[in-house]
Amino acid sequence: APVRSLNCTLRDSQQKSLVMSGPYELKALHLQGQDMEQQVVFSMSFVQGEESNDKIPVALGLKEKNLYLSCVLKDDKPTLQLESVDPKNYPKKKMEKRFVFNKIEINNKLEFESAQFPNWYISTSQAENMPVFLGGTKGGQDITDFTMQFVSS
């Protein structure tokens, strides 16, 4: 079944942008001016998820790349990765659970909770130029709040 999708950028609540760091990693850093063109454009898709009152299930792909953010266990720890997919089959309404994030929207701020690992969130560090990761704490040092901006084609 077709899915609703949109193109957007994400910035953390400290206004750090997300950029590629090697072929399979994202990092967060402050960008200005022309450097803003480096930021990753996501294709966010509305997918099937668990029933909930306030969470909206989405998948986060990289626009025009066959890469999706996914959550897997590595060394017994929930880990965020960029995973290659067959572009002929993605996005789809019934995404595998590792690709699904519960989007939580409060006061124009977004959180992305892993559907596979409840209470684990897409996170950035306070420090500059550090990897985007899956964090198991909210409201601590690490940043779990993001803002979204549509990208005009």
């Epitope: 899915v3 949109l6 509305f46 901006q149 549509f150």
Partner: antibody
Framework: EVQLVESGGGLVQPGGSLRLSCTAS????????MAWVRQAPGKGLEWVGI???????YYASWAKGRFTISRDTSKNTVYLQMNSLRAEDTAVYYC?????????????WGQGTLVTVSS | EIVMTQSPSTLSASVGDRVIITCQAS??????LSWYQQKPGKAPKLLIY???TLASGVPSRFSGSGSGAEFTLTISSLQPDDFATYYC??????????FGQGTKLTVK
Amino acid sequence: EVQLVESGGGLVQPGGSLRLSCTASGFSLSSAAMAWVRQAPGKGLEWVGIIYDSASTYYASWAKGRFTISRDTSKNTVYLQMNSLRAEDTAVYYCARERQIFSGDMAGWGQGTLVTVSS
Amino acid sequence: EIVMTQSPSTLSASVGDRVIITCQASQSIDNWLSWYQQKPGKAPKLLIYRASTLASGVPSRFSGSGSGAEFTLTISSLQPDDFATYYCQNTGGGVSIAFGQGTKLTVK
């Protein structure tokens, strides 16, 4: 205060075209999804379509091809371009803001603008 | 496309009555269902989303329930301000978002 104001409605002949505008205040369209919903006189609500970013628009099956939704973020305005209009397109056209991205429900509505298709 | 069917189409009731309106989807939509109230000449107003969550500022006499393909809107004790037309809406069905045909609530 969040407000949506539609304009551009009026009388148009069958086969004609019309462009409706919806100007938002109190929030930015740079991260808000906007839908158009219409209501023929004495009838129910009918979803027309929705726009996210300028390249991501979705339509009811009956609206595809004739109706186009676009946006101008600098003017904080969304548009509905209607072509090849027919008598059955006569309706009040509302713009509405999706409560949250992909929530599908509409939490803020304009007052509506009446489109009459008649010769 | 998913079709939403409301019943009844019209309903007569008195102030203080308990009123139930039902909405049926042609296939399962989990809890992706909203309810709206519309008064003549006015824009619709969101009452309930995700089948059972009350929208901001909506009185607690309104409640929603259901999941899958069967949903209900209940007004526990009808007030004079509640006479209006009510619409259900499927909010999760792929790329298209469908409304029910409406239920007009009138004074008995």
